[in-house]
Interface confidence: medium
Amino acid sequence: RKIPKVGHTFFQKPESCPPVPGGSMKLDIGIINENQRVSMSRNIESRSTSPWNYTVTWDPNRYPSEVVQAQCRNLGCINAQGKEDISMNSVPIQQETLVVRRKHQGCSVSFQLEKVLVTVGCTCVTPVIHHVQ
Amino acid sequence: GITIPRNPGCPNSEDKNFPRTVMVNLNIHNRNTNTNPKRSSDYYNRSTSPWNLHRNEDPERYPSVIWEAKCRHLGCINADGNVDYHMNSVPIQQEILVLRREPPHCPNSFRLEKILVSVGCTCVTPIVHHVA
């Protein structure tokens, strides 16, 4: 069975690379930039013409244990009068991220990487109109 | 597997022998989902706060390609297709986890890294500061 490569680039394996069992990757769990902070404009989820709410999912067997998901509040967008305009659409903006999942039995633990799709916010778009013949 | 501290029989992480690296299955769950935002939707063009997508490629990282959004305008596009500077286009940022090859160029040895990406833009009412 061929082991899938992570990434698309072929690497010459330097002599200094640590030995890794087949089918596995070695993962250092000390995190680079662990304490960096998101510096978005204040309250954009409420000030947006396509406002959204946040919900937090918590799973202690996942890193990060908290994943925040956004949900658009409206189908339409908020106009200058503060009313919903259904001739426009609020749509979710999504981003993939990696999480590490832990599976444990007593003192024994295994780890699995997983891609998850996070909805980060919403934007207001002009709808695509399909004309029926 | 490796050891999780659970009671006096398990080691603690301040021991010099405590593993700071773990072996992880190479098969990433959901790895084949579409990662090209240009292909997955055209919101970046249809938005009232449109953005351009810039390809950031780094072979020492997984995923090697990440798309960064840059808002096209300071203002937002109004119903006439013009930029309205009474509103602001602002980026929506998200912290994501990626894998960084460590040591460099090693095919199957990684470290987790948090990076900040701009995913898209949204149109907001500006915060107006009144000068006394």
């Epitope: 769990i29 | 999780i4 501290p5 992480s13 301040e14």
Partner: nanobody, 119 residues
Framework: EVQLVESGGGLVQPGGSLRLSCAAS????????MYWVRQAPGKGLEWVAE????????YYVDSVKGRFTISRDNAKNSLYLQMNSLRAEDTAVYYC????????????WGQGTLVTVSS
């Protein structure tokens, strides 16, 4: 030396209440998330609740939501778990665990306190 000492366990009837305490020492308590974890007889570990450093954010496993409350007193270096409307399935050894220095690891545990819910 880091120490976590749980207390407050015991035998209680279904529907009853208990308050578990965990006294922490040997580290800067206010700098860490803290957890309650339980292990039922013959079962694996179950993460019950987490509380962030300043106590402002708490998380609970679905099976205890609305019945258990995690809290902390940073001035007293203490962690608490108020358990109401107890059920037979809450019977377990309850451990207090110090937050993770490394992601996905609990680096210190207490010795545990046994909670038995039975009529």
């Amino acid at each position: 030396e880091v120490q976590l000492v749980e207390s407050g366990g015991g035998l209680v009837q279904p529907g009853g209440s208990l308050r578990l305490s965990c006294a922490a020492s040997g580290f800067t308590f206010s700098s860490y998330s803290m957890y309650w974890v339980r292990q039922a007889p013959g079962k694996g570990l179950e993460w019950v609740a987490e509380i962030k450093q300043d106590g402002s954010v708490q998380y609970y496993v679905d099976s205890v939501k609305g019945r258990f409350t995690i809290s902390r007193d940073n001035a007293k270096n203490s962690l608490y778990l108020q358990m109401n409307s107890l059920r037979a399935e809450d019977t377990a050894v309850y451990y207090c665990a110090k937050g993770e220095i490394l992601p996905l690891y609990f680096d210190y545990w207490g010795q545990g306190t046994l909670v038995t819910v039975s009529s």
